[in-house]
Each structure stands twice: as C-alpha cells, then as structure tokens.
Interface confidence: medium
C-alpha cells in the first residue's frame, strides 16, 4: 500500500456516566485477503502513550489498563477495533488513541468525557 491505514473514530467525545461501561469506537478498512495475523492494534492514552490494550500476532494480548478493557474479537476481522472500557471512573477522562498497523499504519484519537 502506498498510503497509511485509514483509521476512523467519532468526532464527538464519548460521554459516559461514572460506573457504567463505555465503547470507544474505532474502525479501519481491511484490504482483500486481510487476516488477523497481520494486525497490530494498540490502544494507548494519547498524551502519555501508556498502553491500554493490544492485539498482535493473531491474538488479544489483553488489558494493560486495570483489567477494565476489552476488544470485540468477533468483529476485528471486519475492521472493528473498538474498545470497551468497563466501570468508567472520573480518572479515565481524556483522549485515547487507536493505533492500527497492518503493513503501513494509521491512528486516530477519541475523547472520553465522564459525567
């Protein structure tokens, strides 16, 4: 591919109530013949790049963020890289980046507001 992977997230912040679950939506467009073995997906805090969740080498590497995050494994192959953040806390508020690498890479940031 000559261009970066196109990663799409909602423009508007995701608003969640304390204690509820929030879905940080992120999607990419898989090319024909794409397989999950090619995918490197990294969710990180935008400002510090602290690792939140990752998927690589064909498998979910799990949560690195207080064990409160999950991917949607059945939807990854279709380009759905969304992250589920459970039991939202006030301290979770901020920007999360979805970083997708297949051969090239792309990233986009989604904001979480806690009410």
């Amino acid at each position: 591919p000559t261009g970066a992977v196109e990663v799409q997230v909602p423009e508007d912040p995701v608003v969640a109530l304390v204690g509820t679950d929030a879905t940080l939506r992120c999607s990419f467009s898989p090319e024909p013949g794409f397989s999950l073995a090619q995918l490197n997906l990294i969710w990180q805090l935008t400002d510090t790049k602290q690792l939140v969740h990752s998927f690589t080498e064909g498998r979910d590497q799990g949560s690195a963020y207080a064990n409160r995050t999950a991917l949607f494994p059945d939807l990854l192959a279709q380009g759905n890289a969304s992250l589920r953040l459970q039991r939202v806390r006030v301290a979770d508020e901020g920007s999360f980046t979805c970083f997708v690498s297949i051969r090239d890479f792309g990233s986009a940031a989604v904001s979480l507001q806690v009410a």
Partner: antibody, heavy 116, light 108 residues
Framework: QVQLQESGPGLVKPSGTLSLTCAVS?????????WNWVRQSPGKGLEWIGE???????NYSPSLKSRVTISIDKSKNQFSLKLNSVTAADTAVYYC?????????WGQGTLVTVSS | EIVLTQSPGTLSLSPGERATLSCRTS???????LAWYQQKPGQAPRLLIY???SRATGIPDRFSGSGSGTDFTLSISRLEPEDFAVYYC?????????FGQGTKVEIK
C-alpha cells in the same frame, strides 16, 4: 509517501541555541501522529530528544527537557527543534522522524557542530 | 527509564551465515512495544521490525524478530552483502523512548 527533510545551521557557537526545522511532504502534519527529533553523536548510538502531536502536546527526554522546545507549524507543514545552552556534547547528526511508537520514515539527518 | 542492552557489540560473520542479535530490556515490556532498525554508514536508520515480530514494508523475509518480556531477538537467516550494518532495538513502552547501543554486523 511521507518524506521528511531537516534544515538549519550546521554550526552553532557554545552557549548558543541550536535551531532546526523539519519539512513534511507527501502527507499532512495534522494527522494523528507524533513528530519526533532523534540525534546521534559521532560514532555513538541513537538518542530520542522529544516529540510533538498536532494539538501541540509535547513530550521530552528528561535529560534534555530543561533545554528543549519543539513546536509545530501546521500552515507550513513543518515542525521545529530548539535546543539552548549548547555545548560540544550536543554535536550530533539530528534526525526528524514520524512515529507514534516506532519511527518511520526518517529524514536524512543534518550534522550540527557546536564550536566557536 | 528502560535501558536496552544489545549483545554482542560486534558480530563477525560471512555472507550466507545466520545472524542472531539480542536485545535485553531492564524491565519487562509487552512485545508489541519493541522495534528494530538497520543503519548503514552515512544513512538514517531504517525500520525493520515493529511489534517485536512484524516486518516493515519492503523488508525481506530473511529478517525476523521474536521475544517477549525482557528478551528479544533479531535474526537474519542468510546474510546478504547489503545486510552488513549496525542494528538497533528500541522500546516504546514507556517514556522516554530508548534505544539499545547497537550491534555491528561486519564481514568476517
């Protein structure tokens, strides 16, 4: 295909300020990427200096933080490095690079010598 | 900060031989947070491997990466003349991002 090109003076006097600019072509600097500066002293390894996000958020190496400023000019599709109070130890090849995590691509590098 | 230690410092091999380069991190990191670069004299580093094992665009399959935790390896299955260079590992699991000191692969 994103390409990066460093420019700036090749000679800086001790105690002066090193100023470099990195021009980004083939893509927008406003995309969700960090834009980095890395340096390599003669015959030595690579040292990350710092990075800037299009929003203006910056992260710097703790060892250089007190002397470094990285800025971004989205209208010119470029970002810049300023390193003040330089000494001979700051003589190095300075590279700019795109990278959220790993660095790719890199500029070709520019040698900056600190000498009177 | 996370310190990366590469070994050996220099590897003297002949074309066609296998090269095995080691990178050890001072703290355990997720493998997705490690990259390898190749640098030839007078050139900028070139990304080879990211995520510990994924080859960057255009990198031949004789290059492979592996490892987890604190121990990572870059392997070159059969050295070609153009592979003689310095190789660096880099972690991006925490700030500041740091590099190893490099391993020089030279012709024996």
């Amino acid at each position: 295909q994103v390409q990066l090109q460093e420019s700036g003076p090749g000679l800086v006097k001790p105690s002066g300020t090193l100023s470099l600019t990195c021009a980004v072509s083939g893509g927008s600097i406003s995309t969700s990427n960090y834009w980095n500066w890395v340096r390599q002293s003669p015959g030595k390894g690579l040292e990350w200096i710092g990075e800037i996000y299009p929003t203006g958020n910056t992260n710097y190496s703790p060892s250089l933080k007190s002397r470094v400023t990285i800025s971004i000019d989205k209208s010119k599709n470029q970002f810049s490095l300023k390193l003040n109070s330089v000494t001979a130890a700051d003589t190095a090849v300075y590279y700019c690079a795109r990278g959220w995590n790993w660095f790719d691509p890199w500029g070709q590098g520019t040698l900056v010598t600190v000498s009177s | 900060e996370i310190v990366l230690t590469q070994s050996p410092g220099t590897l003297s091999l002949s074309p066609g031989e296998r090269a095995t380069l080691s990178c050890r991190t001072s703290q355990s990191i997720n493998g997705i947070l490690l990259a390898w670069y190749q640098q030839k004299p007078g050139q900028a580093p070139r990304l080879l491997i990211y995520g510990a094992s994924s080859r960057a665009t255009g990198i031949p399959d004789r290059f492979s990466g592996s490892g987890s935790g604190t121990d990572f390896t870059l392997s070159i299955s059969r050295l070609e003349p153009e592979d003689f260079a310095v190789y660096y590992c880099q972690q991006y699991g925490s700030s500041p991002r740091t590099f190893g000191q490099g391993t020089k692969v030279e012709i024996k």
